[in-house]
């Protein structure tokens, strides 16, 4: 038996096996964002649906106030997709007018906040220049990776411009994490 | 022992532990698509390779008729990438002609069909405006997230335009799911 | 008990259960790339940070010389994101000059090398035309999927142009794998 050390036959020692079904897990889906104040030089955080439709939290993984709370230390797979949409980007207008051609951009960051550490840690970033030549535009940014997280850590999703987030459908913009 | 309740020493009680190797899993890869009829107002579904090359299904996860069949209730990570390619998008041609500049777009949807609901449920959507100024273009859309699925549910991948899907390589366009 | 076969009551037989915490896992993050020679007709491989910051390897998953070494056969989820950035792409300049309009492109490939097989196997590819009309541009390509890997397999990430990879932040460009 993997996870069982060799020991005298009268004494069995087990590694911490567990049922997969009781691991902390969450899938959160987009809701309409209410404008909130956010720190200067810090991207605003999205808030999320955690119960209705496809959204759920289970096994002590809780959602509160824009944060997913990590209930148990371990390795987690963390993911998010944010779909952005906007009108013609400033970039092309600026370019046409002969002004500097610094592109507009869209950015998603999955951030970890640890009480014992003063600065948030950026776990994942997806950033893209948006330089559409005309017309409305829309596009997703997807992120996902594995991280060693500690009990009490908090995860959030920050975006460069909350007004560009497509909040119309739960399948377009979402955020999740699960203990491996 | 996590997963073992406290009990009299002569009686051991276990949570439903299982070997990870026996969990339902599938990774499907792209094949050339044969034109098929699809419902009006519903994107066409892709069909897939399930045995050759990198593709596999295992542990009662079956592929049939464009669908991945979920053999056991639980939380699954579901993912897909579709690589699209096309010629200059209509968007730029329309724009040049001075007509309305609504962009072309490419869309991937991972859809769930369940026996308990008459409508397909869109689990994941990746949608992107395509407004290339000239030339051939190509780009992937990637999706992945965790969902609570029921035994008997069926998953498929729908796309906005089957003729734009790059079916040339198994690593460019794929679809998979695994029980967590 | 799932994973326990029926057997005489004095003899318990177990499926190979294991503690999740002892599974091979790695998350590697970008470092500045040193120019290295690479084979003609083969995209150059990135090298990675495996210890500092968010990066780690554990449970016999080792990183050496651009490769993640698979220590145990099984099904792995493998992922990578590469963020590219560049100046105005050639594509638009070529087009403006009336020359052929084949687009520039950016490509990421996750490749498996097996000692017993002469050719590397491309597991995942994300490829995108880059045809920006002006200005600097930047964008990520994300990949992730599940593969059946064998003990001794080696994984690497190849890119079409190493000079376009954004190596500035560990959250922008990364590579990981974990045994399911």
């Amino acid at each position: 038996l993997k996870g069982q050390e060799f020991a005298p036959s009268h004494q069995q020692v087990y590694a911490p096996l567990r049922a997969d079904g009781d691991k902390p897990r969450a899938h959160l889906t987009v809701v309409r964002q209410t404008p909130t104040q956010h720190l200067k030089n810090q991207f605003p955080a999205l808030h999320w649906e955690h119960e209705l439709g496809l959204a759920f939290t289970k096994n002590r993984m809780n959602y509160t106030n824009k944060f997913l709370l990590i209930p148990e230390s371990g390795d987690y797979f963390v993911y998010s997709q944010v779909t952005f949409r906007g009108m013609t980007s400033e970039c092309s207008e600026i370019r046409q007018a002969g002004r500097p051609n610094k592109p507009d951009s869209i950015t998603v960051v999955i951030t970890k906040v640890t009480d014992s550490y003063p600065e948030p840690t950026q776990l994942l970033m997806g950033t893209k220049s948006v330089c559409e030549v005309g017309s409305n535009w829309f596009q997703p940014i997807y992120l996902g990776a594995m991280f060693s997280l500690q009990e009490g850590d908090k995860l959030m999703v920050n975006v460069s411009d909350i007004s560009l987030v497509d909040y119309t459908k739960e399948d377009k913009t979402f955020f999740g994490a699960f203990l491996l | 022992l996590k997963g073992q309740e406290f009990a009299p020493s002569h009686q051991q009680v276990y949570a439903p532990l299982r070997a990870d190797g026996d969990k339902p899993r599938a990774h499907l890869t792209v094949v050339r698509q044969t034109p098929t009829q699809h419902l009006k107002n519903q994107f066409p579904a892709l069909h897939w390779e399930h045995e050759l090359g990198l593709a596999f299904t295992k542990n009662r996860m079956n592929y049939t008729n464009k669908f991945l069949l979920i053999p056991e209730s639980g939380d699954y990570f579901v993912y897909s990438q579709v690589t699209f390619r096309g010629m200059t998008s209509e968007c730029s041609e329309i724009r040049q002609a001075g007509r309305p500049n609504k962009p072309d777009s490419i869309t991937v949807v991972i859809t769930k069909v369940t026996d308990s609901y008459p409508e397909p449920t869109q689990l994941l959507m990746g949608t992107k405006s395509v407004c290339e100024v000239g030339s051939n273009w190509f780009q992937p859309i990637y999706l992945g997230a965790m969902f609570s699925l029921q035994e008997g549910d069926k998953l498929m991948v729908n796309v906005s335009d089957i003729s734009l899907v790059d079916y040339t390589k198994e690593d460019k366009t794929f679809f998979g799911a695994f029980l967590l | 008990l799932k994973g326990q076969e029926f057997a005489p009551s004095h003899q318990q037989v177990y499926a190979p259960l294991r503690a999740d915490g002892d599974k091979p896992r790695a998350h590697l993050t970008v470092v500045r790339q040193t120019p290295t020679q690479h084979l003609k007709n083969q995209f150059p491989a990135l090298h990675w940070e495996h210890e500092l910051g968010l990066a780690f390897t554990k449970n016999r998953m080792n990183y050496t010389n651009k490769f993640l070494l698979i220590p145990e056969s099984g099904d792995y989820f493998v992922y990578s994101q590469v963020t590219f950035r560049g100046m105005t792409s050639e594509c638009s300049e070529i087009r403006q000059a009336g020359r052929p309009n084949k687009p520039d492109s950016i490509t990421v490939v996750i490749t498996k090398v097996t000692d017993s097989y002469p050719e590397p196997t491309q597991l995942l590819m994300g490829t995108k035309s880059v045809c920006e009309v002006g200005s600097n541009w930047f964008q990520p390509i994300y990949l992730g999927a599940m593969f059946s890997l064998q003990e001794g397999d080696k994984l690497m990430v190849n890119v079409s142009d190493i000079s376009l990879v954004d190596y500035t932040k560990e959250d922008k460009t990364f590579f990981g794998a974990f045994l399911l």
Epitope: - | L39, N65, L69, P118, G152, K154 | -
Partner: antibody, heavy 116, light 106 residues
Framework: QVQLQESGPGLVRPSQTLSLTCTVS????????MHWVRQRPGRGLEWMGR????????KYNPSLKSRVTITRDTSKNQVSLRLSSVTAADTAVYYC?????????WGQGSLVTVSS | DIQMTQSPSSLSASVGDRVTITCRAS?????MYWYQQKPGKAPKLLIY???NLASGVPSRFSGSGSGTDFTFTISSLQPEDIATYYC?????????FGQGTKVEIK
């Protein structure tokens, strides 16, 4: 035109096996789920079970599980119901129903009487 | 089994009246379905997912509710609405129906 048509004998002897076939047209059975529902005289509706035609996965009403079998033949676009050891209490109109991914459609029903 | 308790078992109303039928599930369900069955005919789906109108169904029919308590409403009863109406839950095994509400015209 989407259609579901139940067929089979209208009279079955007690202790025998009731067999009905549902033939579908106008849609791909593999895209959906096929159910059997019955309605006994003057009574409400009772769900008997369903099959996922593409792979043949079945789910049954536990109260009938020991007696009911649902199968499919996708080449003939047919789903079949077998109910063993019938009694007079199994006299009912038996409906074939499509669900999942498409609007629910019911067949017109097939009356089966159990009598000696 | 999830028991579905439908009330009333029958009702009589005038043309143009608002008619309400309730269905209570013995445990919470996410989706409720409402069917109409006319004499000698197969049931026809009217409402799915508690509140979605099935294709081709007149807008005078509506559904609401969540958890254990659900309501089906005919905003203005028409002569062609004479039928028996059933609620159904599709989630637990077995799928179960209410016992039906017979609607008649006064």
């Amino acid at each position: 035109q989407v259609q579901l048509q139940e067929s089979g004998p209208g009279l079955v002897r007690p202790s025998q096996t009731l067999s009905l076939t549902c033939t579908v047209s106008g849609f791909d059975m593999g895209d959906t789920y096929m159910h059997w529902v019955r309605q006994r005289p003057g009574r409400g509706l009772e769900w008997m079970g369903r099959i996922e035609p593409a792979a043949g996965h079945t789910k049954y009403n536990p109260s009938l599980k020991s007696r009911v079998t649902i199968t499919r033949d996708t080449s003939k676009n047919q789903v079949s119901l077998r109910l063993s050891s019938v009694t007079a209490a199994d006299t009912a109109v038996y409906y074939c129903v499509r669900s999942g991914g498409l609007p629910d459609i019911w067949g017109q029903g097939s009356l089966v009487t159990v009598s000696s | 089994d999830i028991q579905m308790t439908q009330s009333p078992s029958s009702l009589s109303a005038s043309v143009g009246d608002r008619v309400t039928i309730t269905c209570r599930a013995s445990q919470g369900v996410e989706y409720m379905y409402w069917y109409q069955q006319k004499p000698g005919k197969a049931p026809k789906l009217l409402i799915y997912g508690a509140s979605n109108l099935a294709s081709g169904v007149p807008s005078r029919f509506s559904g609401s509710g969540s958890g254990t308590d659900f309501t089906f409403t005919i905003s203005s009863l028409q002569p062609e609405d004479i039928a028996t109406y059933y609620c159904q839950q599709w989630e637990g095994n077995p799928r179960t129906f209410g016992q039906g509400t017979k609607v008649e015209i006064k």
